[in-house]
């Protein structure tokens, strides 16, 4: 028998520095977690103690904090190189700055192979990107070799900016021939490493003949055997065992997100490459694990540029940006409109001639808007200003919801109106009318939504049975502020870009902004 230790991360999302327990900015260092300096300590400790170790990343290193905004992926390559990752799969967020924003900072600088079998380049890009990412890699480990095949969510064109010269194929269809090639090469230990979410990970384990282990990402799935060490609730045991169509037991793993845990899986193979046993658990990277001094020093050196950036002007406002709770928790506020417009703008993807865009709607809990921005400071808007408006380090995500769920969400928005509660929704691509004289749960009297399958966008009544795409904060997608119906009834959820980054990019693009209150949210006569 031959034993392999797989160490894995996924959806790190730019958390290079240690974070608080909820993966936001570290405040009390003695209680902080994660970060590459701490990760390195643990990885090195395992490498010294065990003979056959692979360190793998399942994608979405890009996007999530000011680190990515400033360094644009150079930080990912630098610190992943320093940690000596063995391989990485491409995630959807690796395309957030377009293909060039992937090629130059990461693909050309990474010292480890970057993988995806289901992304095929065409046209002029094919020769430019050739060899910079690969469908599979054969990694020598000890006296054996391990095959790694990569995959990436085929929804990436709707979630990011890969351009028109990359084709995202069905994962299973693309993986099988590459696994077959590895088998032909007499590589009999094969890991599928990728970024399509836990449901697809399980399907790959079931359907792709020859895959021995699946290491996934995208869905931020937390798996754990025994008593979990922090706040995350396990979606299943670690590893999650799938019985393949040809009768094999295939371990599937994921390690939550944000570098909070290091996935740790031990696999025992027989001489023919069959999995005999698999066991492990994610390791919580808490403050009991010291940060490596040399990596930490490097982090501090790179940090300097971030502090300078946060005070630079992004753009100007010529109007007061009303982000006060007195406005945003009671009525349409222009800060809410600005943020929603930025959210939609960030999701412009012309992937189908029938649609002017794949999504037109935004909802945003008023309680998530934490500060106004005064225009009487020469109109200047800085990252620092936006960090006061959006201090929670969230993301603006894409969900699919039925019209009936949206109607429930808007009823929830005003079910206890007048108490300055955070659930009052700010909107984009939606016209809503409330009648507060009616009883809670029946106060939405008009709900019109902007069409997407149209050449001239216009507002049509919401259809209860239709499925709509909506951009919203991850806080709402996870049921925050009492929006349990969204969490329970959503049909799809893809995590998006860092909230501040979305708004800052929009302001930089627009240069000068003047959002108005324009009648997106109305109250019927006599009730307000």
């Amino acid at each position: 028998a031959w034993e392999l230790t797989i160490l894995h991360t996924n959806d790190v999302h730019s958390r290079l520095e240690q974070t608080s327990e909820d993966s936001s900015k570290c405040v009390n260092a003695s209680r902080c977690m994660g970060g590459v300096a701490r990760l390195f300590t643990k990885v090195q400790q395992i490498r010294r103690a065990e003979p056959n170790v692979l360190l793998l990343d399942a994608g979405d290193q890009y996007q999530g904090t000011i680190w990515f905004t400033v360094y644009k992926g150079a930080e990912v390559a630098h610190f992943m190189n320093a940690l000596r990752y063995d391989a990485m799969a491409l995630g959807n967020h690796e395309f957030d700055n377009g293909v060039e924003g992937l090629i130059e900072p990461l693909l050309k600088e990474a010292k480890f192979p970057i993988l995806s079998a289901n992304i095929k380049a065409k046209g002029p890009l094919a020769s430019q990107i050739s060899g910079l990412y690969l469908p599979y890699k054969v990694l020598p480990v000890g006296d054996e070799v391990v095959g790694i095949v990569g995959y990436t969510s085929k929804e990436t064109p709707f979630l990011s900016n890969p351009g028109t010269n990359l084709v995202f194929e069905d994962e299973i269809t693309a993986l099988q021939p590459e696994v077959d090639k590895l088998k032909t090469l007499n590589v009999n230990k094969i890991i599928a490493l990728g970024h399509s979410g836990f449901e697809m990970d399980k399907l790959i384990a079931q359907k792709v003949r020859g895959v021995d282990v699946v290491v996934g990402g995208h869905s931020n799935t937390f798996l754990y055997t025994g008593n979990p060490p922090s706040k995350e609730v396990p979606a299943g045991k670690y590893p999650f065992i799938v019985t393949s169509d040809d009768g094999r037991k295939v371990p599937v793993v994921q390690a939550y997100a944000f570098g909070k845990y290091l996935g740790y899986l031990k696999i025992e193979f027989d001489e023919r490459g069959n999995v005999i046993s698999s066991h492990g658990n994610p390791i919580l990277l808490n403050s009991s694990i010291p940060e490596d001094p040399s990596i930490k020093a490097d982090i501090n050196k790179w940090r300097i540029k971030l502090d300078n950036y946060s005070t630079q002007e992004l753009g100007k406002t010529i109007v007061y940006l009303d982000g006060s709770s007195q406005s945003c928790r009671f009525r349409e506020c222009n800060m809410g409109n600005l943020i929603c417009d930025a959210m939609i703008n960030n999701n412009l993807r012309h992937t189908d001639e029938m649609f002017w865009n794949h999504v037109s709607m935004c909802i945003l809990n008023g309680g998530g808007i934490r500060s106004p921005i005064d225009e009487r400071n020469n109109g200047t808007i800085t990252w620092e200003n936006l960090a006061a408006v959006l201090p929670f380090g969230g993301t603006f995500d894409l969900v699919q919801l039925k019209g009936s769920t949206l109607k429930k969400a808007f009823e929830h928005s005003v079910h206890r109106y007048g108490q300055s509660t955070g659930e009052f929704l700010q909107v984009g691509g939606i016209h809503v009318v409330y009648d507060l004289s009616r009883k809670p749960g029946d106060r939405v009297v008009k709900l019109d939504v902007l069409c997407t399958k149209c050449r001239v966008p216009s507002y049509d009544p919401l259809k209860m049975d239709e499925v709509y795409k909506v951009i919203l904060p991850n806080f709402l997608a996870n049921g925050g502020d009492g929006f349990q119906m969204i969490k329970d009834e959503l049909l799809r959820h893809d995590s998006g870009d860092q909230d501040i980054n979305v708004v800052s990019t929009y302001i930089s693009k627009m240069k000068v902004i003047y959002p108005a209150v324009e009648g997106r949210i109305k109250f019927s006569t006599g009730s307000h």
């Epitope: 990474a110 010292k111 192979p113 020598p140």
Partner: antibody
Amino acid sequence: QVQLQQSGPELVKPGASVRISCKTSGYTFTRYYIYWVKQRPGQGLEWIGWIYPGNFNTKYNEKFKGKATLTADTSSSTAYMQLSSLTSEDSAVYFCARDVYDYAGFAYWGQGTLVTVSA
Amino acid sequence: DIVMTQSHRFLSTSVGDRVSITCKASQGVATAVAWYQQKPGQSPKLLIYWASTRHTGVPDRFTGSGSGTDFTLTISNVQSEDLADYFCQQYSSYPWTFGGGTKLEIK
């Protein structure tokens, strides 16, 4: 573009050792295997072994174990092959090469280094 | 070791002709076969890998076929610059082995 530049010809005495270098450019050295191939004058090709500069693991053709030692220096993106206890049978042109996809054919070759073993 | 046999040490052809170079493996290697062209005093050049995939920049008159034990490199519309040695190679099992080569001569 991908390039592999080998060191110049060597004339060595029987029993001695020689080290051939293969300096690479145009790609990330640590991400691809380097293969070594022997060609005797007017003869076919023989695969000697490979090194993976990402972790310095090596694999040898049994026939060349003890004869060839493969190493790599990531700081200079250079691979080396040391040949020891040389005999006239070791007189040959030695090539380094790189693939496009692991193992699947040698796509890029050095220009070759002629080693002549003669008293 | 797997022996790769190229039965013709020499093949003679004319410009514009179609010629097939064959290679037989002593045991099955699926499609783990590459073909190389080598001109005098030069390094080998990869033409085909995975038995039938043409390497970037290789003219489409070069075609590879076969699987298991029998493999063929076909050159249609032979050009004078195709005068060279052609080698097959298997990379299915260690040690990886090459055929003895076939020298293509132009009449």
